[in-house]
């Protein structure tokens, strides 16, 4: 099945690459507009020049196109603990991420959060902190896994995932109990 | 102790409205990042949108962008979501929690109100 195209696509799809459809004569195929810069006014003629007007501070565009306005600079959000990597210029949007030693928590396809990079505290690290995921820990005997931090076997309840990892250590725990002094 | 209560969740129509609140205690409320999150009929969490402290530039999912509108009081330690055009998709538990802070779970969450748009 031949996917359906946007009425845009199809317009474009008419003209040699780097050109687009006259949105008023389809006999005339304009060219696109530089990264940087937005349509301020479509070609008047086949082989004459498109008018492209520069972004303006605070907006860009990433690719040629003809667009009408550009688009509005992304901030990063402090209150997710992002900070800016590279900032906004006419060509690219800006470029958030985290500070070193943390790494970045996807909530949805456009918001990411920052978090510290886990230590494997009473652990041992087996694969180191990434960009986009935290560091993956292995326990030292006596403890487990919680919430990617090593917690002793001592705060291990029954009904919890830790009763295997921890399974000698609560039957200690339930044999303390139960031996009473006669 | 942290405590969040959700209320104003009910049936409505497609394309009608509701404003659901969140009453907070136990901590300092107007410090936090406050967020809504919904959680539809056997599917996972959806991030809905959030507010910082001050209220500025708050975040909203495409899916609501243009829709939805979160607000809060600091005087009344109040978290809302007005949202409006209700679709059929909306239909969720929805919750307010506070931002996360030591990683991605959350810690605070309230129980929930039951979203249902149904003609």
């Known amino acids: 099945l031949v996917p359906h195209l946007g009425d845009r696509e199809k317009r474009d799809s008419v003209c040699p690459q780097g050109k687009y459809i006259h949105p008023q004569n389809n006999s005339i195929c304009c060219t696109k507009c530089h990264k940087g810069t937005y349509l301020y006014n479509d070609c008047p003629g086949p082989g004459q020049d498109t008018d492209c007007r520069e972004c303006e501070s605070g907006s860009f565009t990433a690719s040629e196109n003809h667009l009408r306005h550009c688009l509005s600079c992304s901030k990063c959000r402090k209150e997710m603990g992002q900070v800016e990597i590279s900032s906004c210029t006419v060509d690219r949007d800006t470029v958030c991420g985290c500070r070193k030693n943390q790494y970045r928590h996807y909530w949805s396809e456009n918001l990411f959060q920052c978090f510290n990079c886990s230590l494997c505290l009473n652990g041992t690290v087996h694969l180191s902190c990434q960009e986009k995921q935290n560091t993956v820990c292995t326990c030292h005997a006596g403890f487990f896994l919680r919430e990617n931090e090593c917690v002793s076997c001592s705060n291990c309840k029954k009904s919890l995932e830790c009763t295997k990892l921890c399974l000698p250590q609560i039957e200690n725990v339930k044999g303390t109990e139960d031996s009473g002094t006669t | 102790e942290v405590q969040l209560l959700e209320s104003g969740g009910g049936l409505v129509q497609p394309g009608g409205s509701l404003r659901l609140s969140c009453a907070a205690s136990?901590?300092?409320?107007?410090?936090?990042?406050m967020v809504w999150v919904r959680q539809a009929p056997g599917k996972g969490l959806e991030w809905v949108s959030h507010?910082?402290?001050?209220?500025?530039?708050?975040f909203y999912a495409d899916s609501v962008k243009g829709r939805f509108t979160i607000s809060r009081d600091n005087s009344k330690n109040t978290l809302y979501l007005q949202m409006n055009s209700l679709a059929a998709e909306d239909t969720a538990v929805y919750h307010c929690?506070?931002?996360?802070?030591?990683?991605?779970?959350?810690?605070?969450w309230g129980q929930g109100t039951l979203v249902t748009v149904s003609s």
């Open positions: 136990g901590f300092t409320f107007a410090h936090e990042t």
């Open positions: 929690a506070l931002l996360p802070k030591r990683g991605p779970w959350f810690d605070y």
């Open positions: 507010i910082p402290p001050d209220g500025q530039d708050p």
